[in-house]
């Protein structure tokens, strides 16, 4: 025999108190799949969190962080204060990247500069606390009589898709 609750779509719940008819989720709750016997309480984006996407009857709210803070963890489970580019957040606050490392964002950790020599290339532009090194042509390509080289394409900021 088919479970009558399986006919209840997302956004409703199978109400045992009302002969297993499908009732809409109450305000501030949702069900993202059919056949649910209860609706889940919507996440509330409060304090240092702000609402990125409102809760609907079929999907939970999504949070990000208020100005000066950024998300950490799956689904933005925490917010932490921004640091400057060229820094990383430690237990003692924001600290400058050590020599040989960089961070080009207000969040995350300092990462080592690219080792150009591993790819057989030379350093075209030195790295800084905020920027990675730029690798150029291999030293052999720079020897007298070598053909001219095409300058490297400008680096894209991470996290941005091409226009």
């Amino acid at each position: 025999l088919q479970d009558p609750c399986s006919n209840c779509p997302a956004g409703t719940f199978c109400d045992n108190n009302r002969n297993q008819i499908c009732s809409p989720c109450p305000p501030n709750s949702f069900s993202s799949a059919g056949g649910q016997r209860t609706c889940d309480i919507c996440r509330q984006c409060k304090g240092v969190f702000r609402t990125r996407k409102e809760c609907s009857s079929t999907s939970n709210a999504e949070c990000d962080c208020t100005p000066g803070f950024h998300c950490l963890g799956a689904g933005c489970s925490m917010c932490e204060q921004d640091c400057k580019q060229g820094q990383e957040l430690t237990k003692k606050g924001c600290k400058d990247c050590c020599f040989g490392t960089f961070n080009d964002q207000k969040r995350g950790i300092c990462r080592p500069w690219t080792n150009c020599s591993l790819d057989g290339k030379s350093v075209l532009v030195n790295g800084t606390k905020e920027r990675d090194v730029v690798c150029g042509p291999s030293p052999a390509d720079l020897s007298p009589g070598a053909s001219s080289v095409t300058p490297p394409a400008p680096a894209r900021e991470p996290g941005h898709s091409p226009q």
């Epitope: 984006c45 409060k46 208020t66 000066g68 640091c83």
Partner: antibody, heavy 118, light 107 residues
Framework: QVQLQESGPGLVKPSETLSITCTVS????????VHWVRQPPGKGLEWLGV???????DYNPSLKSRVTISKDNSKNQVSFKLSSLTAADTAIYYC????????????WGQGTLVTVSS | DIQMTQSPSSLSASVGDRVTITCRAS??????VAWYQQKPGKAPKALIY???YRDSGVPSRFSGSGSGTDFTLTISSLQPEDFATYYC?????????FGGGTKVEIK
């Protein structure tokens, strides 16, 4: 206990640059941000900008080209500078701490009155 | 910029009265609203953040509510020390903006 104290010049001339220092105690600038807010006599509050624990700054676009906020963690001091002053910049200037729970101001300094006049 | 419009701009009330101040945002700010109290010659004092969370040490007669664009600060039973000006502030996006203030005076 948490305290913030502003110290300013009181009177400055038009076109000059205003410099105010906020000295804090009871908390560390390594962990907390500090906002600057002003209030013209008899009027409401205007947010000017903030310096975060890591030293990054955000300014009100209406004043961005004129405002600079910096800090010295070891001296427990935050510095506020406003250039190209006019009489419209006459106000009480407050510094205030940002808590770790929201982008708001939980503790305020007593404020310093700055009058712009020749 | 997000405009925060407070009403009324001033009100007269008696000790023991229930007082309600409203604040309307020009666009959705979720629950990212704070309320401050300012007495003459003094710095503002934080009362409420996140629309409804009382700051530590704030008496329970102060309560906040609302989300989206409409927010309310309620003083359930006005005390002599509550006569002051009250400001709302949104912190959903930069620049942070304040309402114009509501002055609560003695009737």
């Amino acid at each position: 206990q948490v305290q913030l104290q502003e110290s300013g010049p009181g009177l400055v001339k038009p076109s000059e640059t205003l410099s105010i220092t906020c000295t804090v105690s009871g908390f560390s600038l390594i962990s907390y941000g500090v906002h600057w807010v002003r209030q013209p006599p008899g009027k409401g509050l205007e947010w000017l900008g903030v310096i975060w624990s890591g030293g990054s700054t955000d300014y009100n676009p209406s004043l961005k080209s004129r405002v600079t906020i910096s800090k010295d963690n070891s001296k427990n001091q935050v510095s506020f500078k406003l250039s190209s002053l006019t009489a419209a910049d006459t106000a009480i200037y407050y510094c205030a701490r940002n808590p770790l729970t929201a982008t708001v101001m939980d503790y305020w300094g007593q404020g310093t009155l700055v009058t712009v006049s020749s | 910029d997000i405009q925060m419009t407070q009403s009324p701009s001033s009100l007269s009330a008696s000790v023991g009265d229930r007082v309600t101040i409203t604040c309307r945002a020009s666009q959705n700010v979720g629950t990212n609203v704070a309320w401050y109290q300012q007495k003459p010659g003094k710095a503002p004092k934080a009362l409420i953040y996140s629309a409804s969370y009382r700051d530590s040490g704030v008496p329970s007669r102060f309560s906040g509510s609302g989300s989206g664009t409409d927010f309310t600060l309620t003083i359930s039973s006005l005390q002599p020390e509550d006569f002051a000006t009250y400001y709302c502030q949104q912190y959903n996006s930069y620049p942070l903006t304040f309402g114009g203030g509501t002055k609560v005076e003695i009737k």
